[in-house]
Each structure stands twice: as C-alpha cells, then as structure tokens.
C-alpha cells in the first residue's frame, strides 16, 4: 500500500447496492443510479464514484438516470425518476379504440 499522490477531498456516502461491503462508502463523490432492465422494475443503487465523472452529466433516459453529488451523505434521500417513454405515434388506419 504505497503512499498515494494527493488528490481531491473524499466524501462519505450512503451505500445501498449488491456491491456494498458496508452501509457507507468513501469516494470522490456520491452517486445514485436508477436502472431499469428489460422486463424488470427499476432498481436504485446508491454508492461512491471515483471514475467516469462524465456519467454524472448524462441525461436521463427511459432506462437509466445517473445522479452525482459532492457532500457527505448527500445521496441518502435522493429519489430519481426515469424519462417517460414516448407514446407510440398513431398508426395510420387505426380507429383509436
């Protein structure tokens, strides 16, 4: 465990996912990720981020919403929603029933 180079401040975050080894984790930022896999209910995971900060800037879609924040336990009470699916455009020849 060599001495690591100095880096930005750490934050402590709520950890709620199958990967958590404890009730909190420590990282560069806190995350909440809401994911909906095909045919399943959306699942919300809370944890820590250290890599790929660009994911924090992604726009919500109907399948994933990625939220990041930078203060202690800031991800604890955050609830996310997915982008509403676009209603299918009406097909010609249908009678709307």
């Amino acid at each position: 465990d060599p001495v690591k180079p100095s880096r930005g401040p750490l934050v402590t975050c709520t950890c709620e996912s199958p990967h958590c080894k404890g009730p909190t984790c420590r990282g560069a930022w806190c995350t909440v990720v809401l994911v909906r896999e095909e045919g399943r209910h959306p699942q919300e995971h809370r944890g820590c981020g250290n890599l790929h900060r660009e994911l924090c800037r992604g726009r919500p879609t109907e399948f994933v919403n990625h939220y990041c924040c930078d203060s202690h336990l800031c991800n604890h009470n955050v609830s996310l929603v997915l982008e509403a699916t676009q209603p299918p455009s009406e097909q010609p020849g249908t009678d709307g029933q």
Epitope: V3, L10, G22, P23, T24, R26
Partner: antibody, heavy 120, light 107 residues
Framework: QVQLVESGGGVVQPGRSLRLSCAAS????????MYWVRQAPGKGLEWVAA????????YYADSVKGRFTISRDNSKNTLYLQMNSLRAEDTAVYYC?????????????WGQGTMVTVSS | DIQMTQSPSSLSASVGDRVTITCRAS??????LAWFQQKPGKAPKSLIY???SLQSGVPSKFSGSGSGTDFTLTISSLQPEDFATYYC?????????FGGGTKVEIK
C-alpha cells in the same frame, strides 16, 4: 510499509489522565478513518472510539463517553486518545486501527498495542 | 446495541481438519460482518469483511458466509499457524460490537 505504532501507555492511578498516541506511516493517513479498540487482560475485544478521516465525526462506546476524547492531526499522521477520570475497568491493551479507504468501519491494519494499567 | 454471539467459545481440532465457527447477531446486519484472528500477545489480524470478502494477503483456506443474523467462518484445512482466537465483529451500526471469541486449540 504500512504501520501503526501506539505509545503513551503506562501505570496510572484511578481518577487520573493519560494520552495515547498512534503514529501512522506508509500510507495516506488523511484518507482513512481511525479507531481505538481495547482488550482487558484475558478478555475479548471492545471497540472504544472512532473518528472520520477528516476529523469531522467522532463516535464513542457508552463505557467511555464523556471521559475519553479521540482526535487526530493529519499534518502529523497521528491519532490520539485522551483518557480522563480513569477507572480500574479501563485497564487494557489499547490498539489503534485504520479502516479501508473505500469502506468506513472495515478495519484492515492494526497497531501492536500499548498497555494501560489503572491501579492505586 | 447489537449483540454478537459466537459459538463454540472454544474447540479442539487437529492439523488438516475443517473447522467452522459461527457468529449470530441479535438483529439483522445485512452482510456487514468482519472476522479477525488473534494470537497470544499479538494484535488482531483482519481476515474477512463484508461477510465473505478476503482481506488482501489472507490465504484462501479462510472463507466466510452468511447474511442477516447468521454467519460462519470456515478454515478448510487447519494448519499449525491457525491455532488462535477468532472474533467476529459487526459494523452495520454504532456502537461497533465484537463477538466473545472462539479459541481454536490443538487436539
């Protein structure tokens, strides 16, 4: 290599004070939470106190609350335990431990311990 | 406070034996459990965290399992250096609490 070395133990009379130190080396001290755990002679392990990596939060066992104070100096890579109003039941080996950088409260490295004897 | 109860408090085993130690929490702690080994006159050594994840450098003869309230530590083939006292510890919530220990002795 990663090392924690406790010091400051000794024999002290009931009601008196003592300050323990834990010198850290070989890792980035300011990235880890730190802990004191004690072990009375012939007994099991007892958690005493915890402090966040930045010193912003501190936690204590009920048995020492109001008498012991945990602190740290990240510029000196040192953890402290100020023990006041000592009692015979505080007699124990005191260990410092650090947690994993990613997982708070998960101990991975321990010091060798320092003995505190409270006796008149 | 969460009470941690280990069993047995001591056991005798021979080199090569498979040894299992159990730890029970007084309430659910998910998988937030650690195991430590301590030899006489020495500091504890961290073995397992997250109920089943091995600490760096710990040999694979040690394994952990369980979730919720019931946990086990298994040593697949006991070696002379494994005779020691083993402690479980929960870190689901403060105060952090340890089990009373299991002393593994030579038969």
């Amino acid at each position: 290599q990663v090392q924690l070395v406790e010091s400051g133990g000794g024999v002290v009379q009931p009601g008196r004070s003592l300050r323990l130190s834990c010198a850290a080396s070989g890792f980035t001290f300011s990235s880890h939470g730190m802990y004191w755990v004690r072990q009375a002679p012939g007994k099991g392990l007892e958690w005493v106190a915890a402090i966040w990596y930045d010193g912003s939060n501190k936690y204590y066992a009920d048995s020492v609350k109001g008498r012991f104070t945990i602190s740290r100096d990240n510029s000196k890579n040192t953890l402290y335990l100020q023990m006041n109003s000592l009692r015979a039941e505080d007699t124990a080996v005191y260990y410092c431990a650090r947690d994993q950088e990613q997982w708070p409260d998960v101990f991975d490295i321990w010091g060798q311990g320092t003995m505190v004897t409270v006796s008149s | 406070d969460i009470q941690m109860t280990q069993s047995p408090s001591s056991l005798s085993a021979s080199v090569g034996d498979r040894v299992t130690i159990t730890c029970r929490a007084s309430q659910g702690i998910r998988n937030y459990l650690a195991w430590f080994q301590q030899k006489p006159g020495k500091a504890p050594k961290s073995l397992i965290y997250g109920a089943s994840s091995l600490q760096s450098g710990v040999p694979s003869k040690f394994s952990g399992s369980g979730s919720g309230t019931d946990f086990t530590l298994t040593i697949s083939s006991l070696q002379p250096e494994d005779f020691a006292t083993y402690y479980c510890q929960q870190y689901n919530s403060y105060p952090l609490t340890f089990g009373g220990g299991t002393k593994v002795e030579i038969k």
